[in-house]
């Protein structure tokens, strides 16, 4: 009983439960396939708890193995619109520091419109992750539709 | 080594681990979009260890952060089928109560047979998630193509 | 504080964080189905803390709940490849022992080249999890296309 | 309710073409396949063809030459025709459909088309 | 094409006895974690009626009296008890894939 009330008084980032799930915010300028998040409570079921945005790009505050998922669904956007804008691309990587540049998770979306998937992988204190759409259609905006987060997993 | 053994002595519930795993139990009359879910050690390989069934939809025991996570498979389908019915949507929402009713996951099917994705949501104690599969394609109820579930992450 | 410091001392295994993500090795030879898996830090962003590989298979150390994910994505792939090669199926099972066999999770291409998904089971230490990909289509061995892992997540 | 009313010939020369009009209610046709189903004492119940929704068809292999089914959905009507009618083709016509979802059981029926093929 | 094979072709029962049909499919119609078999009732003059759906569903407004089990390949539709109105053609039909096919039915009469 002692011990069970000791765990909820202790701070939840001395346990590692770094989390974030971000919503879109908008699309990078002309040359930039970045898309930009945004996340927090005020803008509906998002959030930062311990990974923080710079810019619009998510940066990792703890060291450990994080799961990252990522739903992307692209805007008005049928089965034909897809294979019509083929190849529309979307990937996942650690962008800065530059020396630790290395994509994660990458995928086209040939026919289909959305785009879903998660990984586990090692992320450092510093690391900022982009997420590049490459193509010329746009992303949906919608909150059920479009959204990226991480997990801490373990040191 | 004392911590380790009081640790497991501890019921899992008070660490805050609630988890469920469903498998598809039947769709809903006429006008009735949702899916209807079943779990248990003795259907096979789901279950439901926190959160509890209520007619067939996933009600929330414990506050947190949760990974809800889906896949569908649709019946006898193949790319034809699947665009010749499109569209074809699945979504994922918060049902009730109906003052937190919100769509949480929306994905189509487009020329696939196939959906699948997860994200990271905070849910209440209360909320009963309900799946809206729409169109008139049938959801395959085999255990390995058509599933449902939710892991608490955090508080 | 003392809390905290004592549990950082803990043996990480002690709380059961067993996780493992693997890229791809090679395919089988000609009637083995089964992609056969590789991990570790000198291959990049793999990793196995706890699970082993077994042959190429994955095999599991520590009974539990578990959360299994994959994505292969098919090379040199394009929508009109995939319908001409289909059927091209995914199949994720545990494989031995023979008396647990059963398949977990399973995904068609159709009109895509990219499957991914995941799933919450149960696995006991001893299973070996087998990926069957069946078709005539080559999996991409790039890291960030093509991997598969589990994450405990609760006794 | 919903409502499959048929319209059509009775009988019909041999080599001639023989056209059935279905006409819906309470549903619309770009929602539901349509099907088409023949009953003669010969050969039982012989499903004939469907067309989906997106106005594509799929027809029995062994009639597949001879067939056509058309649709307008604005008028809620299919259309079906059969080429080159022989005597074994005399038989009761039916449109039928699906209630939700769009597989090949059908709790929803026309009345039926007669048609006897003779000289 | 898939061959269903009704038996028995006709049979004769008692008000109030069970009447058993059985339709053999001659490769398995499930899929997908259904059976596609599907059972009608026929009466001179009208259209076949929807009985049973997906092996075992009653289709709305039918008589809880009948009712429908099998997988794979091997189908029964049982109606207990059996009322007069209840005599009539009984079909299966598979929508497993295409072309669906259609039993060569079942003669139910009354003893």
């Known amino acids: 009983q002692r011990f069970a009330q000791a765990q909820q008084q202790l701070p939840l980032e001395s346990l590692g439960w770094d989390v974030a799930e971000l919503q879109l915010n908008h699309t990078g300028p002309q040359q930039d396939p970045r898309l930009y998040w945004q996340g927090g409570p005020a803008l509906g079921r998002s959030f930062l708890h311990g990974p923080e945005l710079d810019k619009g790009q998510l940066r990792i505050h703890r060291d450990g193995i994080y799961m990252v998922h990522i739903q992307v669904t692209l805007a008005i956007c049928s089965s034909t619109t897809a294979s019509r804008h083929h190849p529309t691309t979307l990937a996942v990587g650690i962008c800065s520091p530059a020396s630790r540049s290395i994509s994660l998770l990458r995928l086209s979306f040939h026919q289909g419109c959305t785009i879903a998937s998660q990984r586990l992988t090692p992320l450092a204190r510093g690391d900022t992750l982009c997420t590049n759409l490459t193509g010329t259609l746009l992303p949906s905006r919608n909150t059920d539709e479009t959204f990226f987060g991480v997990q801490w997993v373990r040191p | 080594q004392r911590f380790a053994q009081a640790q497991q002595q501890l019921p899992l519930e008070s660490l805050g681990w609630d988890v469920a795993e469903l498998q598809l139990n039947h769709t809903g009359p006429q006008q009735d979009p949702r899916l209807y879910w079943q779990g248990g050690p003795a259907l096979g390989r789901s279950f439901l260890h926190g959160p509890e069934l209520d007619k067939g939809q996933l009600r929330i025991h414990r506050d947190g952060i949760y990974m809800v996570h889906i896949q569908v498979t649709l019946a006898i389908c193949s790319s034809t089928t699947a665009s010749r019915h499109h569209p074809t949507t699945l979504a994922v929402g918060i049902c009730s109560p109906a003052s937190r009713s919100i769509s949480l996951l929306r994905l189509s099917f487009h020329q696939g047979c196939t959906i699948a994705s997860q994200r990271l949501t905070p849910l209440a104690r209360g909320d009963t998630l309900c799946t809206n599969l729409t169109g008139t394609l049938l959801p395959s109820r085999n255990t390995d193509e058509t599933f449902f579930g939710v892991q608490w992450v955090r508080p | 504080q003392r809390f905290a410091q004592a549990q950082q001392q803990l043996p990480l295994e002690s709380l059961g964080w067993d996780v493992a993500e693997l890229q791809l090795n090679h395919t089988g030879p000609q009637q083995d189905p089964r992609l056969y898996w590789q991990g570790g830090p000198a291959l990049g962003r793999s990793f196995l803390h706890g699970p082993e590989l077994d042959k190429g298979q994955l095999r599991i150390h520590r009974d539990g709940i578990y959360m299994v994910h994959i994505q292969v994505t098919l090379a040199i792939c394009s929508s009109t490849t995939a319908s001409r090669h289909h059927p091209t199926t995914l199949a994720v099972g545990i494989c031995s022992p023979a008396s647990r066999s059963i398949s977990l999770l399973r995904l068609s291409f159709h009109q895509g080249c990219t499957i991914a998904s995941q799933r919450l089971t149960p696995l006991a230490r001893g299973d070996t999890l087998c990926t069957n990909l069946t078709g005539t289509l080559l999996p991409s061995r790039n890291t960030d296309e093509t991997f598969f892992g589990v994450q405990w997540v609760r006794p | 309710q919903v409502q499959l009313k048929q319209s059509g010939p009775g009988p019909v020369q041999p080599s001639q073409s023989l056209s059935i009009t279905c006409t819906v209610s309470?549903?619309?046709?770009?929602?539901?396949?349509i099907h088409w189903v023949r009953q003669s004492p010969g050969k039982g119940l012989e499903w004939l063809g469907v067309?989906?929704?997106?106005?594509?068809?799929d027809y029995n292999v062994a009639l597949m030459s001879r067939l056509n089914i058309t649709k307008d959905n604005s008028k809620s009507q299919v259309f079906f025709k059969m080429n080159s009618l022989q005597t074994d083709d005399t038989a009761i016509y039916y449109c039928?459909?699906?209630?939700?979802?769009?597989?090949?059981?059908?709790?929803?029926w026309g009345q039926g088309t007669l048609v006897s093929v003779s000289a | 094409d898939i061959v269903l094979t009704q038996s028995p072709a006709s049979l004769a029962v008692s008000l109030g006895q069970r009447a058993t049909i059985s339709c053999r499919a001659s490769?398995?119609?499930?899929?997908?974690?259904?059976?596609?078999l599907h059972w009608y009732q026929q009466k001179p003059g009208q259209p076949p009626k929807l009985l049973i759906y997906?092996?075992?569903n009653l289709e709305s407004g039918v008589p809880a009296r009948f009712s429908g089990s099998g997988s794979g390949t091997d189908f029964t539709l049982n109606i207990h008890p059996v009322e007069e109105e209840d005599a009539a053609t009984y079909y299966c039909?598979?929508?497993?894939?295409?072309?669906?096919?259609f039993g060569a039915g079942t003669k139910l009469e009354l003893k």
């Open positions: 039928a459909k699906n209630r939700r979802y769009d597989y090949a059981w059908f709790p929803y």
């Open positions: 490769k398995s119609v499930s899929a997908s974690g259904y059976s596609f």
């Open positions: 067309i989906w929704r997106d106005g594509s068809t």
């Open positions: 309470d549903f619309s046709l770009t929602i539901f396949g």
């Open positions: 997906l092996t075992s």
């Open positions: 039909q598979h929508s497993r894939d295409f072309p669906p096919t």
